[in-house]
Interface confidence: low
């Protein structure tokens, strides 16, 4: 089928970077400025993506490939092909609808993006807390209390984590 189509359709001879111009007897015309065609046989060229505002250009548009964007400092990409930029927060914070808020007690975030996650509950694995958690770091679990030599002490386990979100910081 593809072979038959290519024999019948002169547009199939137009390579990437051109389009089959119906207004000019189906001649293969180069894509105009700020447009591209990434495959052959196209009847139109696609408009290049413009990286404006909070987006910045990671890769310039060419006649055969679209521009690629990333985000200006202080923001990070979200979605396929960096379709959105989302504000960075500091470690120890999460982005809420009201902006960056500190992680609630019992939760942490060690990245500039994403949500605060509950500290590991060491006791679920039969272990004790070796190093307390912070807003930026998870707790470090140590050996189980039974593994500790007599007289050794462990740090008090953390309180149960609360849901992150509405507590004013």
């Amino acid at each position: 089928f593809e072979r038959t189509r290519s024999l019948q359709d002169p547009c199939s001879n137009c390579p990437a970077g051109t389009f089959c111009d119906n207004n000019r007897n189906q001649i293969c015309s180069p894509c105009p400025p700020n447009s591209f065609s990434s495959a052959g046989g196209q009847r139109t060229c696609d408009i290049c993506r413009q990286c404006k505002g909070v987006f910045r250009t990671r890769k310039e548009c060419s006649s055969t490939s679209n521009a690629e964007c990333d985000c200006t400092p202080g923001f990070h990409c979200l979605g396929a092909g960096c379709s959105m930029c989302e504000q960075d927060c500091k470690q120890g914070q999460e982005l809420t609808k009201k902006g960056c808020k500190d992680c609630c007690f019992g939760t942490f975030n060690d990245q500039k993006r994403g949500i605060c996650r509950p500290w590991t509950n060491c006791s679920l694995d039969g272990k004790s807390v070796l190093v307390n958690g912070t807003k930026e770091r998870d707790v470090v679990c140590g050996p189980s209390p039974a593994d500790l030599s007599p007289g050794a002490s462990s740090v008090t386990p953390p309180a149960p984590a609360r849901e992150p979100g509405h507590s004013p910081q």
């Epitope: 505002g53 909070v54 987006f55 504000q87 982005l95 809420t96 009201k98 902006g99």
Partner: antibody, heavy 121, light 106 residues
């Protein structure tokens, strides 16, 4: 300094369409969401909704779904409010207001001067 | 939707005096309330955000307090330029303005 400058007053007939603008300057337009607020004569302020200025996604308050449309011209750092099929009760001053917390919610630190829309046969 | 009940709707006070306006939310708004001064023919002006944080350039005669569902806004040592309508705004979940309080000087 940060400024929001709105278009001038409009006199329209019922059933017509109006489109008012809010031109921002002094900051990166696509970094902060833009809300629209209505004040009918002798009444209080009423939040109409907001538009995310980098994704272009609008959110409308329940009372403003249907005839109301928010849009952007990011190259001109301008937000627009369009009201279709105008009714007498649309007579009001409309304000644009910039959120403080990026394209998220937050208090309004910056306001336009308002645009009076009068609907009268 | 969160409702904001603001009272009183109007009040009259003497120069040099003190007034207090209250806003009650229909649910806990976690201190996410701001207060605005609005004069005719102008855009509203932010006075206080996050319950009690004074906006730069606003005199310390203005103050705010509250928690949970109940919040208040006060102006002490009233001056002629304080004549305006004042609004509370919750921004905990979308936005809702209070009904406004028109302040007049006796």
């Amino acid at each position: 300094q940060i400024q929001l400058v709105q278009s001038g007053p409009e006199l329209k007939k019922p059933g017509e369409t109006v489109k008012i603008s809010c031109k921002a300057s002094g900051y990166t337009f696509t970094t902060y969401g833009m809300s629209w607020v209505k004040q009918a004569p002798g009444k209080g302020l009423k939040w109409m909704g907001w538009i995310n200025t980098y994704s272009g996604v609008p959110t409308y308050a329940d009372d403003f779904k249907g005839r109301f449309a928010f849009s952007l011209e990011t190259s001109a750092s301008t937000a627009y409010l369009q009201i279709n099929n105008l009714k007498n009760e649309d007579t009001a001053t409309y304000f644009c207001a910039r959120g403080n917390d990026g394209n998220y919610y937050g208090w309004f630190a910056h306001w336009g001067q308002g645009t009076l829309v009068t609907v009268s046969a | 939707d969160i409702q904001m009940t603001q009272s009183p709707s109007s009040l009259s006070a003497s120069l040099g005096g003190k007034v207090t306006i209250t806003c009650k939310a229909s649910q806990d708004i976690h201190n996410y309330i701001s207060w605005y001064q609005h004069k005719p023919g102008k855009g509203p002006r932010l006075v206080i955000h996050y319950t009690s944080t004074l906006q730069p350039g606003i005199p310390s005669r203005f103050s705010g307090s509250g928690s949970g569902r109940d919040y208040s806004f006060s102006i002490s040592n009233l001056e002629p330029e304080d004549i305006a309508t004042y609004y509370c705004l919750q921004y905990d979940n979308l936005y809702t303005f209070g009904g406004g309080t028109k302040l007049e000087i006796k």
